[in-house]
Interface confidence: medium
């Protein structure tokens, strides 16, 4: 349910973002998001996902790359790049769902 707090099996993920309680979090899947805001350097956030699984399937753009995975600490060593510097054949933002 996209509104209620999530229930169900959770996976432990590396958490590295301004909103992390600690070094790990638990969610329905793990995420890595690389975002470049106008006039700023890209910032990479690692954490947990509970909603909007469809974002995992989005192709990288020059502003955002959204990566998801489903196993224990699977987002720990993932590094993303944005579309402007990445050949189409090497895009890691794929999601099996």
């Amino acid at each position: 349910d996209p509104v209620k707090p999530s229930r169900g099996p959770l996976v432990t993920c590396t958490c590295e973002s301004p909103h992390c309680k600690g070094p790990t979090c638990r969610g329905a899947w793990c995420t890595v998001v690389l975002v470049r805001e106008e006039g700023r350097h890209p910032q990479e956030h690692r954490g947990c996902g509970n909603l909007h699984r469809e974002l995992c399937r989005g192709r990288p753009t020059e502003f955002v790359n959204h990566y998801c995975c489903d196993s224990h600490l699977c987002n720990h060593n993932v590094s993303l790049v944005l579309e402007a510097t990445q050949p189409p054949s090497e895009q890691p933002g794929t999601d099996g769902q």
Partner: antibody, heavy 121, light 110 residues
Framework: EVQLVGSGGGVVQPGRSLRLSCAAS????????MHWVRQAPGKGLEWVAV????????YYADSVKGRFTISRDNSKNTLYLQMNSLRAEDTAVYYC??????????????WGQGTLVTVSS | LPVLTQPPSASGTPGQRVTISCSGS????????VNWYHQLPGSAPKLLIY???LRPSGVPDRFSGSKSGTSASLAISRFQSGDEADYYC???????????FGTGTKLTVL
Amino acid sequence: EVQLVGSGGGVVQPGRSLRLSCAASGFTFSNYAMHWVRQAPGKGLEWVAVISYDGSNKYYADSVKGRFTISRDNSKNTLYLQMNSLRAEDTAVYYCARVRYYGSGSPIGYWGQGTLVTVSS
Amino acid sequence: LPVLTQPPSASGTPGQRVTISCSGSSSNIGGNTVNWYHQLPGSAPKLLIYGDDLRPSGVPDRFSGSKSGTSASLAISRFQSGDEADYYCAAWDDSLNAYVFGTGTKLTVL
């Protein structure tokens, strides 16, 4: 910058209808669940309704269930609250609000300025 | 009966530590995270604490949240006159399928 601008408030007679709108800007509207919260004059906050990012899930407070309908038009970046069979106790400032982050169960993180609805004969 | 109960008022002197309680049940505070909002007169509410004890950026570290069982607390250390406001706790309620706010606490400076 997240901006939520409510409109459509005013004075209405008991039993009549009113539709509130909330124009959203500064973020990808279609990614976020949205709430309506109201506050009667001199009283506390009362949650009214919530709608999921895609409109597939809606929940209502018991006090408005069957009378109010929350909806959204993601192509217009607009949230709505259709209020029917209005009562004097529906008199309040109605706040449109966005959740803080994508995750389910996210708290309300951003609030509009509020629009006043007065139900009076 | 209110779902989340707060004391109607609280007060403190500048520099003091002030605490506001919020009492609920297993279907809300006991099973879901607690959020705190404050509201200055004539303004929209503002998120102060979320996820029981997390502060949004821009909120001073003088504000802290905690939870134990079906009760939650908001603590304000080094209380200031600018902290005078109405404070509300909130949480999702699984039984009601609703987001519920506390009754609110008016915090004043002595």
